[in-house]
Each structure stands twice: as structure tokens, then as C-alpha cells.
Interface confidence: medium
């Protein structure tokens, strides 16, 4: 049978031929009668056999990491007969490992993100190196990890390659670190090979910084003419954090929030100071407000960094705007009696300059020839007034600043002209009537009424009487109806057209004014010849046709 030991050949042998071992048949007595042959992959090129002795040699340098074993076949032939002495047999040549490969990190590049301020021991990332040498051959592929760069912030577990935080880091001081990890084989013993890798460790932001105002004092100005909602300026706080952690909200401390407000521009992270209520330079010419700023999002566990909000003081100066004069009243109503003499006092208006300068004021009345106004605001009449022509005047008073004539204010002025009893009552129309020749005594021939152009505080009351001469020798009499009308009656029986064709009766009408005024009004009465039918009358000078009163033709 075949006789051999297990064959090993060390890799990376530099000699031209290296004896591996011997293949031998136990029938071989050493007299060179047998011939040994080598078959299979590598036979003749990598391995050769001494045909006489069966010694095997490696004639090439081998690399275990390329090929760790060779399976060959052996034959032994009797030279004399040419026949196989032994059956063909397979055998194995193993390439034994030497430490000729350094550890390699195959998953490069390494990058990790870890929150800033993470506690010691926090896992960052695991790096893994691999060694092509034989793990079963001693310590050639047994690795140890160590940190070449990254202390004191990081550490690496020697056997696992797990990188952990060993000291708290502040992103605001440094936001990324390069850590260099070395892997050594031979568990670090002399002769070990090593490989390194770099790990980029980025710190993610946590909200460990509160926003702080850049300035402890801001100065802003606002015009007193500015409408509510006007932006009067911006304030700015800075937060060393980034992103959402740097978003902030501005506000005004409660006591100061009557007149101003602060809104936050979330794009620029600025605070915009807004006018909440109109300001008046003359009332208050400056304001002081305290503003504060806080982060928008603060997790509960980070509140310790945000205990006291940053504050700033804002000085706001109100800028004076020249304002038009201000009348004491929104409008004025005065009364003056009619017929008062020119230059009579009507009333006084007053306007003042609301500005601190207190400019003198000049007054004028627009479109009026009836009233005057002086620089003191005193209004007088420039003509006599007649209530019966105009009972009310709707005017406009203008006040102008003496030193700035562009500053003008106008308000309505209403003047009521009060009545005096300067008109006597008179017939409400022209009265002309007739009496028949055959009229009897006490016959009603006309009802009369009166009007008075004056205004009466109470109702008008008129008193009707005949004049003294008519009372004494009149053919007619009058009865006052006590309702501002009176009736005229015949005072005799029978009239003569030829003798006396027309009568003119003087009627006195008095009013109830104080003093009372009386007018004399003439009533014309024609004497007519009335037929029995009474429908047509023939009178001297003209024919009077009776129909719903009289129509003269």
C-alpha cells in the first residue's frame, strides 16, 4: 500500500524548490525499480516528484490566501512491466499560513452622527476589520482595536471595535471629529501587522443654548402719525444652536405691552416691534419696554439650560409731527336775535395747537358776508339779520396755525337767528265780497283769516276788530271767532246799489306778541242786485259770479 504523512508547505517560501515530503509504496525496496508519477492541478508546475524516490517538492512560492490546499493524484509503476504497482491515490497538500496579511477595514468610509452632550459610554459606531490570514492558525488573524486619534472624547473596545463616547462634547465648540482606529493582528504581539481607518463623527445639535440678545439696549423711533400695526424696528437675539433648536419667540414683558407688541419673523429669527396703539407726542414722547426671547421648542430634559429668558430694553422715542389746530368742540351752535345792530356779539370759538410749540391760531369764516371772526375767535354780525329771510346759517370755521399755514382745521358753525316780533298779522289773501241790496241784518257775508310772518313761541293768536270810524257808523259788523278767523255780518237791512255801490271796511288785526303789533286791512264789499234765484247778481262796474268764493272778471 501507499505510505505517506500529511503534507504541509508554508506559504511565501522564496527557495526554488522546497521538499514537502515523500510518497512511497511499501512494495518499494529501494532498488529504483519503481517510477512515481504526480497528476492533477499543479503537478509539474507547482509541485514535482522525484520519480525514483517519490519525494515531492514545491517549486513555486505559494500564497495560502490565494489557495490553501491542493488535491493531487499519485501513481507508482513498475518500470520493468509498466504496470501499476499500487492503485492510483489522491492526496492533499495543505498550504500552511504565515502572518503575511494586515487587517483591513472593508466598510470604509465610516461616518457616524451622535447628539452633542451625550453621556460617557454612548455607542457611536462599530468598526470591523478583517484579516485574510488563517483564523485557525495561531493568532495570525486575531485582531485588537485601538484608538490612534480621538482621545479624550472617544474610546474603542479592543475586541469588538465598538466606539463609545468617553467625554461630553459641545457641538457649539466643535461640531465634528476625526477618529483614527487601528486594528492589529497577532493580538498585538511583536511582529503583528496593522491597518487603520478614519471615522468622521458628526455631532448633532441639541437645544442646550438659549437665545441671547445681541444688545442689552435698542433704540427705536416712531412717528406720532404712524398708524397701528406699523413696524417700527427690529431686535435680534442669537442662539448658538442650529435649525429647530435656534427657532425663537420674542415677547414683551406684561407690564409694557399696552402700546407696543413684538412679533417674530420665523424666517429671519428677528423680533419686529409693532405699534399696537397710536402714540401722541404731546401726551408721552418716549417709552421704555422690556422684551424677552425664548426658544420655540425646548424638550423637558433640556429646560435646565433655559431657566431664565434673555431680556433687552427698548427705548422708543416718539417723533413729533406738526398737527393741525384742534377745536375745543366738534361743532358750534350760536343764537342771535334778528335785527340786532351790526357788530353784535354772536359767540366765541376756540382752537389750540396740539403741538408743544403752541403756535398762535388765526380764524376765518368761509363764504359769509353776514358774520366776522377775529383772532380771538369772537364772532360778530357784519349786517343786520332778518329771521324771515334766513332763520339758520350753516357756516364753516377754519383755524390756521400762524407759523404754518398748511396746518388747517375746519368745523361746522350753526347760527340760529332768533325771532323778534317785527311783523304784524295781515290778511292771508286779498278779500273782495258782495252784499245783496235786499240783504237782511246779521247776514254773514265773508269769513276772513290772517297770517303772521313772525315765528311764535306759543301758537299765534290774532284779534280782529273794525276800525274806530267803521265801528261808529258801519253798515257791517265783525265777530272774532277766537280761532284766528272772523266773520263779517251786515249791520242793517237793505242796501242801495245806486246810492252806495261799494263799501271799504278797515279791519284791524292784532297779534299776541310782546309788544303786540296791529295792521289795518281793507275788505272791499260790492252791493249787488240779486235776482230772486240768487244765482246772478248785477253790480255796478262789474258782474260778480258767485261760485265757491268770488272770481273777478
Amino acid at each position: 500500500g501507499w505510505v505517506w504523512n500529511q503534507f504541509f508547505v508554508p506559504e511565501e517560501m522564496n527557495t526554488t524548490s522546497h521538499h514537502i515530503g515523500q510518497l512511497r509504496s511499501d512494495l518499494d525496496n529501494g532498488n529504483n525499480s519503481f517510477q512515481y508519477k504526480l497528476l492533477g492541478a499543479g503537478a509539474g508546475s507547482t509541485f514535482i516528484i522525484d520519480e525514483r524516490t517519490g519525494d515531492i517538492y514545491a517549486i513555486q512560492k505559494l500564497d495560502r490566501e490565494e489557495r490553501s490546499l491542493y488535491i493531487l493524484r499519485a501513481q507508482v509503476i513498475d518500470i520493468a512491466t509498466g504496470r501499476a504497482v499500487e492503485p492510483e491515490s489522491e492526496f492533499v497538500i495543505k498550504v500552511s499560513d504565515i502572518n503575511d496579511n494586515e487587517p483591513k477595514f472593508l466598510d470604509e468610509p465610516y461616518e457616524a452622527i451622535v447628539p452633542e452632550m451625550s453621556p460617557e459610554g454612548t455607542l457611536v459606531i462599530q468598526v470591523t476589520a478583517s484579516d485574510a490570514d488563517d483564523p485557525s492558525s495561531g493568532n495570525n488573524a486575531r485582531l485588537l482595536y485601538s484608538l490612534l486619534q480621538g482621545q479624550p472624547y472617544f474610546s474603542v473596545e479592543p475586541t469588538t471595535g465598538v466606539i463609545r463616547i468617553s467625554s461630553k462634547m459641545d457641538r457649539e465648540l466643535q461640531d465634528e471629529y476625526w477618529v483614527i482606529i487601528q486594528a492589529k493582528d497577532m493580538i498585538g504581539q511583536p511582529g503583528a501587522l496593522s491597518g487603520t481607518t478614519s471615522v468622521l463623527i458628526k455631532l448633532s445639535d441639541v437645544n442646550d443654548n438659549k437665545p441671547i440678545f445681541k444688545e442689552s439696549l435698542y433704540r427705536l423711533t416712531v412717528s406720532e402719525s404712524a398708524p397701528t400695526g406699523t413696524s417700527i424696528g427690529t431686535i435680534m437675539a442669537y442662539d448658538n444652536d442650529i435649525g429647530e433648536n435656534a427657532e425663537m419667540d420674542y415677547s414683551i414683558e406684561e407690564d409694557d405691552s399696552q402700546t407696543f407688541d413684538i412679533i417674530t419673523n420665523h424666517e429671519t429669527q428677528e423680533g419686529i416691534v409693532i405699534l399696537k396703539k397710536k402714540v401722541d407726542f404731546e401726551h408721552q414722547n418716549h417709552y421704555g419696554i422690556r422684551a424677552k426671547v425664548k426658544n420655540h421648542h425646548v424638550p423637558e430634559q433640556l429646560m435646565k439650560y433655559h431657566t431664565e429668558a434673555s431680556t433687552t430694553f427698548i427705548k422708543i422715542q416718539v417723533e413729533d409731527v406738526d398737527e393741525p389746530p384742534l377745536f375745543l368742540l366738534p361743532y358750534y351752535v350760536f343764537e342771535v336775535f334778528e335785527e340786532t345792530p351790526q357788530g353784535s356779539f354772536v359767540g366765541v370759538v376756540s382752537a389750540t395747537d396740539p403741538d408743544n410749540r403752541k403756535s398762535p391760531i388765526r380764524y376765518s369764516i368761509t363764504r359769509s358776508k353776514v358774520f366776522n371772526i377775529n383772532d380771538n375767535g369772537t364772532i360778530t354780525t357784519s349786517n343786520s339779520l332778518d329771521r324771515e329771510i334766513s332763520a339758520w346759517y350753516n357756516l364753516s370755521i377754519t383755524a390756521t396755525e400762524k407759523y404754518n399755514i398748511e396746518q388747517i382745521s375746519s368745523i361746522p358753525l350753526y347760527v340760529q337767528v332768533l325771532n323778534i316780533n317785527d311783523h304784524a298779522p295781515e290778511f292771508s289773501q286779498y278779500y273782495e265780497t258782495y252784499v245783496c241790496e235786499n240783504a237782511g241784518s246779521g247776514q254773514v257775508i265773508q269769513t276772513i283769516s290772517a297770517v303772521d310772518r313772525d315765528e311764535s313761541i306759543e301758537e299765534h293768536h290774532f284779534y280782529f276788530n273794525l276800525s274806530v270810524e267803521d265801528t261808529n257808523n258801519s253798515s257791517f259788523t265783525i265777530i272774532d271767532n277766537q280761532d284766528n278767523t272772523a266773520v263779517i255780518l251786515t249791520n242793517r237791512t237793505g242796501f242801495n246799489l245806486q246810492e252806495e255801490p261799494v263799501f271799504y271796511i278797515s279791519i284791524l288785526i292784532a297779534d299776541n306778541g310782546i309788544p303786540s303789533l296791529t295792521s289795518t286791512n281793507t275788505l272791499t264789499i260790492h252791493v249787488c242786485d240779486c235776482g230772486d234765484s240768487g244765482s246772478t247778481q248785477t253790480c255796478q262796474y262789474q258782474e260778480l259770479v258767485l261760485s265757491m268764493g268770488f272770481k273777478t272778471e
Partner: antibody, heavy 119, light 107 residues
């Protein structure tokens, strides 16, 4: 040390002019709003004028507006008050005063300089 | 403008006594913008109290301020010899106006 020192006071006739100066030292002058305040036996303390830290805004009491001008030279740490058309009632001790950073009260005053307006 | 009226005009007290000075405004002083100053003869005024009740830097705690709106008080709990002086109140909420002063003199 931190101090304000006024100068330039004196006797002047009505209608005349005078220029007061106030030298600041020991603090960052250019960071503070500065004021002039005067004191008369009759009216007591009366605020006169203010100028903002950078000179950008100036405001005056009604009694002096149009006659007095406040100015400053931050490079020389000096505050000025130019007084024209002086009246008898302007007679007073004039103080320069520093406004605090967060308000309008005065945390630092000079010793004052006397201005007498008399014919 | 806001007019400040101080009372009494003169306060005669002995060292160690308590002094209470009053300052009344003609209209409400916004946000308690009121200060107190001390003026010794021949010297410039010195800030004591601001914001109605906050003591200025270096001011002894025997000085205290109180009040809001229109009525304010300066209290000196126990008078020291150097406290005999004139005291002024000042409002700085609407322009700048001062009271006419209260003289604290030795009895």
C-alpha cells in the same frame, strides 16, 4: 475713575451765546445717551436736552427748543451744549448727565457749571 | 407734562429717626418710571432709586422706594448724618420732570 466734568459757564448778556462742554472719562462714552439738566433756585431741576449715543437723535425741552443745540464728539468723549439767544431765565447751574442703559433716569452726573444771564 | 409734587417741603428729624418722603404725580406714571435722587449742598444729584423701588448700585439698604400710579414714597429707615440733604423725585415715563424737592434737615 468714572466721571463727568462740565466747563464753559460764565456771565453773558441777554441775547448772547455760550458753549458748554462736558468731558467724560472712565466709561464707554459712545455707548450712552447723554443729557443736559439745569437747576435754578426758582424752578428746581429741569431737563434741557438729550442726544442719543451715536448722535442720531436729539430732543429738547420746549423752553429751549430752537435756541439750544446739543451735540457730541465720541472720538473726544465730549458732550456739548450750544446756547444762543440767552434769556435771563436761562440762568442756572447746568449739569451733564448720563442716562442708564435701560431707561431715562440719570445714574451719573457732573458737578455742574454756572451760567448767569444778566444785563 | 406730568407735574410732580413733593411733600413735605422740609422734614426736620434727628439721626436714627425714620424719614418718609412723598411724591405725587398729576397723572399716572407709566410702568413705575420714577426715580429718586439725593443732592447734598454744592454737589450734583446722586441716583438712589429707579423703577420706583429698585436701589441703584452702592446705595445702602436703609433707602427704599415704593408706590405706583400717582403716589410714590421714599423711606429712609434710620437717618445717618450724611443723609441730611435735598431729595428729588423724577418721572421718566413721559419726557423728564422733577419734583421741587424735600429738604431733610437735622432737628
Amino acid at each position: 475713575q468714572v466721571q463727568l466734568v462740565e466747563s464753559g459757564g460764565g456771565v453773558v448778556q441777554p441775547g448772547g451765546s455760550l458753549r458748554l462742554s462736558c468731558a467724560a472719562s472712565g466709561f464707554s462714552f459712545s455707548s450712552y445717551d447723554m443729557d443736559w439738566v439745569r437747576q435754578t433756585p426758582g424752578k428746581g431741576l429741569e431737563w434741557v436736552a438729550v442726544i442719543w449715543y451715536d448722535g442720531s437723535n436729539k430732543y429738547y425741552a420746549d423752553s429751549v427748543r430752537g435756541r439750544f443745540t446739543i451735540s457730541r464728539d465720541n472720538s473726544k468723549n465730549t458732550l456739548f451744549l450750544q446756547m444762543n439767544s440767552l434769556r435771563v431765565e436761562d440762568t442756572a447751574v447746568y449739569y451733564c448727565a448720563r442716562e442708564t442703559g435701560e431707561g431715562w433716569y440719570f445714574d451719573l452726573w457732573g458737578r455742574g457749571t454756572l451760567v448767569t444771564v444778566s444785563s | 407734562e406730568i407735574v410732580l409734587t413733593q411733600s413735605p417741603g422740609t422734614l426736620s428729624l434727628s439721626p436714627g429717626e425714620r424719614a418718609t418722603l412723598s411724591c405725587r404725580a398729576s397723572q399716572s406714571v407709566s410702568s413705575s418710571y420714577l426715580a429718586w435722587y439725593q443732592q447734598r449742598p454744592g454737589q450734583a444729584p446722586r441716583l438712589l432709586i429707579y423703577g420706583a423701588s429698585s436701589r441703584a448700585t452702592g446705595i445702602p439698604d436703609r433707602f427704599s422706594g415704593s408706590g405706583s400710579g400717582t403716589d410714590f414714597t421714599l423711606t429712609i429707615s434710620s437717618l445717618e448724618p450724611e443723609d441730611f440733604a435735598v431729595y428729588y423725585c423724577q418721572q421718566y415715563g413721559s419726557s423728564w420732570t422733577f419734583g421741587q424737592g424735600t429738604k431733610v434737615e437735622i432737628k
